[in-house]
């Protein structure tokens, strides 16, 4: 009879065990365990009748189609085998054990005691059939196994082979290389690869297989397993396989599809191809005169681009437009996108006008082309070129006039200062009292007329000032403050100020330049009580043209000591000699009560201590500060007076050979102007040089050399 066993383990004994088994007996045990397991069988006791080749009694172990072992006897001999310690393993999940005894037993035999169990099959170790084994990685587990793939691969639906996803490859460059996946390693199985070459219309794709070509093939049937097919429009080339690469292919198309198919077996290295775009050829190019073409090639094809540039000093000229470079392209029909432009010599064109300067051409015919040269110069003697620049400019390759120092910036013509068009009188003899100034003797002298309409009735007064540049007047702060409130410093509005320059005789203003004020700047620390910091600036609405009667005075170097005692200086003004004259009379042109003609006086600088003592001895709170100096004579007789306020006290500077403004007429008194031991007090300008430059928006170094040459 047959016993069916389905457990994962169990025990099998001969009939009657442990007693002797009966004669003429046959029992079959069929053991079935789940897939992924095999059966292990071993015997703990075995005692059967011995016979040649186990003809009488035996235990036979088999599978469906194979006898695994036949046992009989008590111990193993040449012709019979006992299991002993031997273990019987089934190849699969089924094992059949048959016990048979014949009709006679000469002795009493106890039979057998056997045990079985299901044991795991390690499929990863034992699968040698390529059709069943994992393509890449195998993972065993109790009762089964599974396959996985390397990075970049996908497990096929057969759960065994590894394929790649390679159906979405687009190539748009004009040249490229395409290979089978993982080339030159064996390509993946079960894969469908699609490569699209899509170029711009006008190109034609040429294919060339290179290096190794190894695709699984068949001796009789053309490419049944793996293959390449090339699809050009409706036409299909291939299939291609084996070890011989196809010949180069000229597709005559800008769009090509390459199909690569692999089945689930085989180990072949694959393929590699390069593709190249071919286009129509364009005619040969000639570079322009004074120019070049880049890149320089023997032949140019569709989509090739060339850059036309010119030699230094020349510009590309295309359709009357100047440019640095010009690009043209070979079109799909084999023509160039544009004609080759010409190279035209760079033209810097007419140089920029120089304020207060002139231009002379060094090159014949007043040429303004590349490498031409011009020279700027200033309108001497009224202006001088800043930093003694050469003024030479060359037409550069960039089309701009360039100076070695200034680059493309124009030079600056600065007003010459402190050099009257007629020389001031010698300082040998002392002048008692004032004298008429010749025209052009004090070209920096400014008449400042103020009409303050912010008060009712309007206030009118005047003072003097000194021209520092074409746009700035230096004066005393008290001239430019509102007069009506004696203890407050309120600057007059710029609208209320008129400046006259080049004025000699106040009765004849026709030859003078009159200018409105753009800004009125009083020193922020001006003190109305003691006239400390009595200095101010007026910026003119428009720069004034310089000439023999209008020229700036020089500013001093920054010297806290100020002018040395006993130095002689000159001061000019239209100040009134008659103290009872009114402003209305001063400003009306017909008056004889003020000095119609500009007056000047020569005065020595008074030692500071002497002046201080002179004022301290008076009743009243007079203060001669370090920002002031005094000038005049002990015996009196000559002095500055009302209306001279803000005028420049100038001293000739031997070093620079120029007249320098050292003082500004500030205050004096309380006695009448020119009284004995009443020195005129002047603002010490050298203490304010930095402040002045700052207000004028010029770095000191710009103008300083003019004084110190």
């Amino acid at each position: 009879h047959t016993v069916e066993l389905n457990n994962m383990f169990g025990q099998i004994q001969s009939p009657g065990y442990p007693d002797s088994y009966p004669s003429d007996s046959e029992v079959t045990w069929n053991i079935t365990v789940p897939d992924g397991f095999r059966i292990k069988l071993y015997f703990m006791h075995f005692n059967l009748e011995s016979s040649y080749l186990c003809e009488y009694d035996y235990v036979k172990v088999e599978t469906e189609d194979q006898v695994l072992a036949t046992f009989c006897g008590r111990e193993t001999t040449d012709t019979e085998q006992t299991p002993g310690q031997e273990v019987v393993l089934s190849p699969g999940s089924f094992m059949s054990i048959t016990f048979r005894s014949d009709f006679s037993n000469e002795e009493r035999f106890t039979g057998f005691d056997a045990h079985y169990m299901a044991v795991d099959v390690d499929e990863c170790k034992e699968r040698e059939d390529e059709e069943l084994s994992c393509d890449h990685y195998c993972h065993n587990y109790i009762g089964g196994y599974y396959c996985s793939c390397r990075f970049g691969y996908i497990l096929h639906t057969d759960n065994r082979t590894c394929r790649v996803e390679c159906s979405d490859n687009l190539f748009t460059q004009r040249t490229g290389v395409i290979t089978s996946p993982d080339f030159p390693n064996p390509y993946p199985k079960s894969s469908e690869c699609l490569y699209t070459i899509e170029l711009e219309e006008g190109f034609m794709v040429n294919l060339q297989f290179e290096d190794i070509f190894d695709i699984e093939d068949h001796p009789e049937v053309p490419c049944p397993y793996d293959y390449i097919k090339i699809k050009v429009g409706p036409k299909v080339l291939g299939p291609f396989c084996g070890e011989k690469a196809p010949e180069p292919i000229s597709t005559q198309s800008h769009s090509v599809l390459i199909l690569f198919h692999s089945d689930n077996s085989g180990e072949n290295r694959g393929w590699r191809l390069s593709y190249r775009a071919a286009g129509n050829e364009c005619p040969e190019l000639q570079p322009p005169v004074h120019g070049k073409i880049e890149p320089s090639q023997a032949k140019y094809f569709f989509k090739d681009q060339v850059l036309v540039s010119c030699d230094t000093g020349y510009k590309v000229l295309k359709d009357n437009v100047e440019m640095d470079t010009f690009q043209i392209e070979c079109l799909k029909d084999g023509t160039w996108s544009n004609k080759i432009p010409t190279c035209k010599i760079v033209d810097c064109r007419a140089p920029g006008e120089l304020e207060h300067g002139l231009i002379t051409f060094s090159t014949r015919n007043n040429l303004t082309t590349y490498k031409s040269e011009i020279k700027y110069s200033c309108q001497e003697p009224y202006y001088k070129m800043l930093n003694n620049n050469t003024g030479i400019y060359t037409c550069s390759a960039q089309g701009v006039w360039m100076n070695k120092v200034l680059g493309r910036s124009l030079p600056t013509c600065l007003p010459e200062c402190g050099q009257p068009s007629r020389s001031l009188p010698s300082l040998v003899k002392r002048i008692i009292g004032g004298r008429n100034a010749e025209p052009g003797l004090f070209p920096w002298q400014a008449l400042i007329v103020v009409e303050d309409t912010s008060r009712v009735p309007n206030d009118k007064w005047f003072g003097s000032g000194a021209l520092l540049s074409a746009s700035w007047i230096l004066t005393a702060a008290h001239v430019l403050r509102s007069q009506r409130r004696d203890t407050t410093v309120i600057p007059v509005s710029k609208e209320h100020v008129t400046v006259y320059l080049g004025l000699h005789d106040v009765r004849d203003k026709s030859g003078a330049v009159n200018s409105s004020a753009a800004r009125v700047v009083l020193h922020p620390d001006f003190n109305i009580q003691n006239y400390n910091h009595d200095i101010a600036l007026v910026q003119l609405q428009e720069p004034v043209p310089l000439g023999p009667h209008v020229m700036p005075v020089c500013l001093p170097r920054l010297e806290p000591e100020g002018p040395a005692p006993h130095m002689l200086g000159l001061v000019a003004g239209w100040g009134i000699s008659n103290p009872n004259v009114t402003v209305d009379e001063i400003i009306s042109s017909g008056t004889r009560t003020l000095s119609d003609v500009l007056q000047y006086v020569k005065l020595p600088v008074v030692p500071h201590a002497e002046c201080k003592t002179s004022y301290e001895s008076r009743s009243g709170n007079y203060s001669v500060t370090e920002n002031m100096f005094c000038a005049g004579y002990y015996e009196g007789g000559k002095d500055t007076c009302l209306g001279d306020s803000g005028g420049a006290f100038v001293i000739f500077d031997d070093l620079s050979q120029r007249w320098v403004v050292q003082g500004l007429v500030s205050w004096g008194g309380p006695e009448e102007c020119g009284s004995k031991q009443v020195y005129g007090v002047y603002t010490k300008v050298s203490n304010y040089v930095d402040w002045v430059w700052e207000q004028m928006g010029l770095p000191q170094s710009v103008v300083e050399p003019q004084v110190e040459r």
């Epitope: 912010s454 008060r455 009712v456 009735p457 009118k460 004696d486």
Partner: antibody, heavy 113, light 112 residues
Framework: QVQLVQSGAEVKKPGASVKVSCKAS????????IEWVRQAPGQGLEWIGE????????NYNEKFKGRATFTADSSTSTAYMELSSLRSEDTAVYYC??????WGQGTLVTVSS | DIVMTQSPDSLAVSLGERATINCKSS????????????LAWYQQKPGQPPKLLIY???TRESGVPDRFSGSGSGTDFTLTISSLQAEDVAVYYC????????FGQGTKVEIK
């Protein structure tokens, strides 16, 4: 012709503030100083201060510094005087005048608890 | 501050007679730059704002009758009504604007 029109009378409690307005017409408002003067009942004239509307420049009588504030609105040609921390002795008629010549009609400010 | 002192405090004058008011300042009101004395005279009638009569010590404001005149310089100034009229009854103030302005205490002019 030049005219200055002031705001109406005010009654204020001690410690409060008052703001008097002065609207100008007939001339360029920004270009002339506006002065403020007061006159206590039966008393003389006392100068408070001034403002130049175009620039905002001000001058104050020391006595009123910190208590009086002058402002001007060029768009409406109106000057303002604000007096704070009022006390009974501030009861007066307050006048604005264009620099020295033209006066407003006056604004009576009464300070009473 | 500059102190302005008027004299007399009040004045009774017959119609058509001369009236003289004095004003003294504690410091000079002459600005040497503009050569102006910054002194003005005002007339105030009851219930009205003051009215400008004289500026710069001696210049008559337009529209002011010529019986009103001003004189003086430095620290001493005078307002003269050459022939008093009934409409001239008022309080007269001097004002200096040389510095932060100050007024005189006022002079009351009445008809005798």
């Amino acid at each position: 012709q030049v005219q200055l029109v002031q705001s109406g009378a005010e009654v204020k409690k001690p410690g409060a503030s008052v703001k008097v307005s002065c609207k100008a017409s007939g001339y360029t408002f920004t270009g002339k100083w506006i002065e403020w003067v007061r006159q206590a009942p039966g008393q003389g004239l006392e100068w408070i201060g001034e403002i130049l509307p175009g620039t905002g420049s001000t001058n104050y009588n020391e006595k009123f510094k910190g208590r009086a504030t002058f402002t001007a609105d060029s768009s409406t040609s109106t000057a303002y005087m604000e007096l704070s921390s009022l006390r009974s002795e501030d009861t007066a008629v307050y006048y604005c005048l264009r620099s020295e010549d033209v006066w407003g009609q006056g604004t009576l400010v009464t300070v009473s608890s | 501050d500059i102190v302005m002192t008027q004299s007399p405090d009040s004045l009774a004058v017959s119609l058509g007679e001369r009236a003289t008011i004095n004003c003294k300042s504690s410091q000079s009101l002459l600005n040497t730059r503009t050569r102006k004395n910054y002194l003005a005279w005002y007339q105030q009638k009851p219930g009205q704002p003051p009215k400008l009569l004289i500026y710069w010590a001696s210049t008559r404001e337009s529209g002011v009758p010529d019986r009103f005149s001003g004189s003086g310089s430095g620290t001493d100034f005078t307002l003269t009504i050459s022939s008093l009229q009934a409409e001239d009854v008022a309080v007269y103030y001097c004002k200096q604007s040389y510095n932060i302005p100050t007024f005189g205490q006022g002079t009351k002019v009445e008809i005798k």
